[in-house]
């Protein structure tokens, strides 16, 4: 049933009223306001922005708006001792140094407190040695180097190009390979789209542009010093040596002008194939070390960054529900940026601001949502999702009992081609139905629905006439809500054409050139894509908070469970002999999925037919829907990843950004042919199959008739 049936709604105050109140011009104005100075986590400027947002959300009409603070480990460059990398000759003289900061964009030359490019949480150090080029530093790249090419990275400084996987995974892989330092660089092959000018004349990365970013491997822990618990005044803090997820070797990022100087001298082995070659005019030799004439030259890193416990601030706004105030729908996105945050995060924060304003307008006219809506402006997302994780740790007991859904709101755009949605299967039908009601902003789709343009441009690989919806991975603030707490989650933004633009992220990601002008001149001059994203995010929140029956369809979970079971079975079947030898069977898992499918189908029939006017029955059915996601949580967590507790989805162990299905089984099977003890390895596969089977069956039983 539609949200207009909620008892507290007058015909005037429906979804249409909420959507009609959203204005592109306001989003534009908010984005400009949020991007004039840097808002780095832990700085005074970001605290002042938090207070401004608190004040404005109150003006917009929220019931309460509070700042919540935590004292977490952050990382900054040393102001008087800059980080850089040198080429040194045999006498130890520096004959080339990488740049100390990015050339500032026009109009921003006199802005203070622009943090220079650095890899957050890099330890200090001055390693020197020969260079090895490791492509993207993915698991498979190190397999190629070590196993096929017999190149040893031990004691070497590795240079890796950004892209394909989360930078923290690159650093972890380099550490495991024995490297003494890591240089990360942006190759034009990945960050310079052909036919587009570099900033300020276009949206491509100039040669001096550099991607900042953290290099942690937190696996969902939050603040490295207080895993599992909020970093409050009485928190016990680990020592730095026991902190979670910190890298052990120095790391530093550079642009492609500087990378050219390092890579042009490379000698040693040739690159294995074209997939290892970027677009610079260099040979892309792997090394180790420089070629003949330069063989006595070495590379030296100079890293002096410091990690320090610093106060951060979330802004939490509440719009109390009229009927079910103890049921929470959360819309959250971060506020902290690396520099100006033109796209990341302020294109998202501006949308959240306008959504709050629209909800506030309705509330001032006497309306309330059925359920409570919480709005969050998270701090320190760029330093490891810290603000959201600490808040969720502090409020975990409330969230696990009352959390209906979490909608994420980081960058609204990463392109201007079509919609991109990642969410729990429970939200598929909500997203389909909503996008059918929204107008497409795309050229050539005037008067057509967003669903239609999205489906045309990003078709589902499995179902014709439907758009693609991806799995949730991580790398953003939904992580703690979905992967740790099991709260149904989703995210939406406008994206690029992945067919024609194969670069990773958008070229100016986390650089000084991510400005208001980048968005206004090149990505969304009319702010129509921002408005569409506001309608999708806001519309999802409206429906989740206002529908009499929660807009979750458990049958869609049944469909994907079967797909994921098929996929993991096919991976295992690449080892038929071992499966036979060790009696590995997926029969139990397929049986559990079948049971889930049948029970979900019956539940959906009951959901359709039950008496919606009976408040006890209604609450009971809604609770079964709300708690279904929770039922996929294993309290023991995944092996070596205690804060990743969702049995169906986890961030890939090889790329934090990507989602993996049946991750416990997947990781047990990964590279199993190389394990020294195959009996133990296949035993672990069997254990993981049993955990997955139990979890799917247990989740199914939560949908059974209660008595």
């Amino acid at each position: 049933k539609s949200s207009s049936e909620a008892t507290n709604i007058t015909p005037k105050h429906n979804m249409k009223a909420f959507l009609d109140e959203l204005k592109a011009e306001n989003i534009k104005k908010f984005l400009h306001n949020f991007t004039q100075i840097p808002h780095l986590a832990g700085t005074e400027q970001n605290f002042q922005l938090a207070k401004q947002i608190q004040s404005q959300w109150k003006e917009f009409g929220l019931d309460s708006v509070e700042l919540t603070h935590y004292d977490v480990l952050l990382s900054y460059p040393n102001k008087t001792h800059p980080n850089y990398i040198s080429i040194i000759n045999e006498d130890g003289n520096e004959i080339f140094n990488t740049s100390l900061f990015e050339p500032p964009p026009a109009g921003y030359e006199n802005v203070s407190d622009i943090v220079p490019p650095f890899s957050a949480f890099s330890p200090q150090g001055m390693p020197e040695g020969d260079l090895v080029y490791v492509n993207y530093a993915r698991t498979e790249d190190f397999f190629k180097l070590e196993r096929d090419m017999k190149i040893n990275c031990s004691g070497k400084i590795v240079i890796a190009r950004y892209g394909k996987v989360f930078r923290g995974n690159k650093v972890k892989n380099a550490q495991l390979a024995g490297a003494t330092g890591v240089i990360l660089y942006s190759d034009p092959a990945d960050y310079f789209a052909p036919g587009v000018k570099s900033y300020p004349d276009g949206w491509n990365l100039p040669g001096g542009g550099v991607q900042r970013g953290n290099i942690l491997n937190l696996n969902g822990a939050g603040d490295p010093l207080t895993p599992g618990y909020p970093a409050n005044e009485y928190a016990y803090r680990r020592g730095i040596a026991e902190a979670v997820g910190l890298p052990s070797i120095p790391v530093h990022p550079i642009g492609y002008y500087d990378a050219q100087k390092l890579l042009e001298k490379m000698g040693g082995s040739a690159s294995p194939d074209s997939s290892w070659r970027g677009s610079l005019k260099v040979p892309y030799n792997v090394g180790p070390g420089f070629t003949g004439n330069f063989s006595t030259q070495k590379v030296k890193m100079h890293i002096h960054s410091t990690s320090e416990v610093t106060r951060i601030y979330n802004v939490i706004g509440t719009l109390r529900g009229a009927v079910e105030p103890d049921r929470y729908v959360i819309l959250g996105g971060h506020r902290d940026s690396w520099v100006f945050g033109g796209i990341d995060p302020q294109s998202g924060a501006a949308v959240v601001h306008e959504i709050v304003r629209s909800f506030g307008t309705l509330k001032k006219e006497g309306w309330r949502p059925r359920r409570t809506i919480l709005f969050a402006s998270w701090d320190a997302e760029e330093f490891g999702l810290l603000g959201s994780t600490e808040w969720a740790e502090e409020n975990s007991r409330l969230l696990q009992e009352r959390g209906v859904a979490y909608i994420n709101a980081d960058s609204s755009i990463e392109g201007n081609y079509t919609l991109r949605v990642d969410c729990t299967p429970l939200m598929y039908s909500l997203v389909y139905n909503l996008t059918k009601e929204l107008e497409s902003p795309d050229e050539g789709f005037e008067g057509k629905s967003l669903y239609e343009s999205w489906t045309k441009k990003s078709p589902s690989p499995e179902f014709s006439g439907m758009p693609r919806i991806s799995k949730l991975g991580s790398g953003n603030d939904f992580e703690v809500f979905f992967q740790r707490l099991g709260i149904a989650s989703g995210r939406a933004r406008y994206t690029k054409n992945w067919e024609t633009n194969k670069f990773s992220s958008y070229p100016l990601y986390h650089s000084v050139y991510e400005t208001y002008e980048l968005v206004e001149k090149f990505y969304d001059p009319m702010f129509k894509y921002h408005l569409t994203v506001a309608q999708v995010r806001g519309g999802m929140v409206f429906e989740l908070a206002n529908s009499v029956v929660l807009p979750f369809d458990c049958r869609d979970y049944a469909v994907v469970l079967r797909k994921y079971a098929d996929k993991i079975y096919n991976i295992s079947m690449k080892h038929p002999q071992e499966m036979k030898t060790y009696s590995v069977s997926f029969d139990s898992l397929f049986s559990a999925v079948k049971n889930f499918t049948e029970i979900a189908s019956k539940f959906s029939e009951r959901l359709r037919d039950f008496d919606k006017s009976n408040p006890i029955l209604l609450r009971m059915m809604n609770d079964q829907l709300m708690f279904l996601e929770r039922a996929f949580i294993d309290p023991l967590g995944l092996p070596d990843r205690p804060f990743y507790r969702h049995v169906i989805y986890a961030p890939s162990s090889h790329n934090k950004y990507a989602g993996e299905s049946f991750p416990g089984i997947y990781d047990a099977l990964f590279d199993i042919e190389s394990k020294v003890d195959p009996s133990q390895a296949w035993g672990e596969v069997k254990r993981q199959i049993s955990i997955a089977t139990f979890t799917v069956q247990a989740a199914a039983e939560t949908l059974s008739e209660v008595a």
């Epitope: 100390l100 030359e109 040669g207």
Partner: nanobody, 126 residues
């Protein structure tokens, strides 16, 4: 209007020192690689030193290496050349020159320069 104004030249004995300054206006120094070049009486223009936009890289002509130091203060929009152990052959008009915008070029000597100042005369004589 883009302007470069050099100062600090003068008469100095061999072995002496001078510090040249170059005040930039009409553009932000922070975005540009910067050069010192010189022209001895009756000779062509000779490149002396270059500094990248951020000061991370400095290159010198072999004839001045170890004696001259180029530096910059981006906050004051000023370029400097510290000249020690001066020799008679260092006598020349010294010009500061603006390199390519670092947003469009790497700021290395082979990028070349576009605008230079009026120059300041340095005379090394006993």
């Amino acid at each position: 209007e883009v302007q470069l104004v050099e100062s600090g030249g003068g008469l100095v004995k061999p072995g002496g020192s001078l510090r040249l300054s170059c005040a930039a206006s009409g553009f932000n120094l922070i975005s540009y690689g910067m050069y010192w070049v010189r022209q001895a009486p009756g000779k062509g223009l000779e490149w002396v030193a270059v500094i990248s936009y951020d000061g991370s890289n400095k290159n010198y002509a072999d004839s001045v290496k170890g004696r001259f130091t180029i530096s910059r203060d981006n906050s004051k929009n000023t370029l400097f050349l510290q000249m020690n152990s001066l020799r008679v052959e260092d006598t020349a008009v010294y010009y500061c020159a603006k390199g390519g915008n670092a947003l469009y070029s790497s700021g290395w000597p082979d990028d070349g320069f576009d605008i230079r100042g009026q120059g300041t005369m340095v005379t090394v004589s006993s």
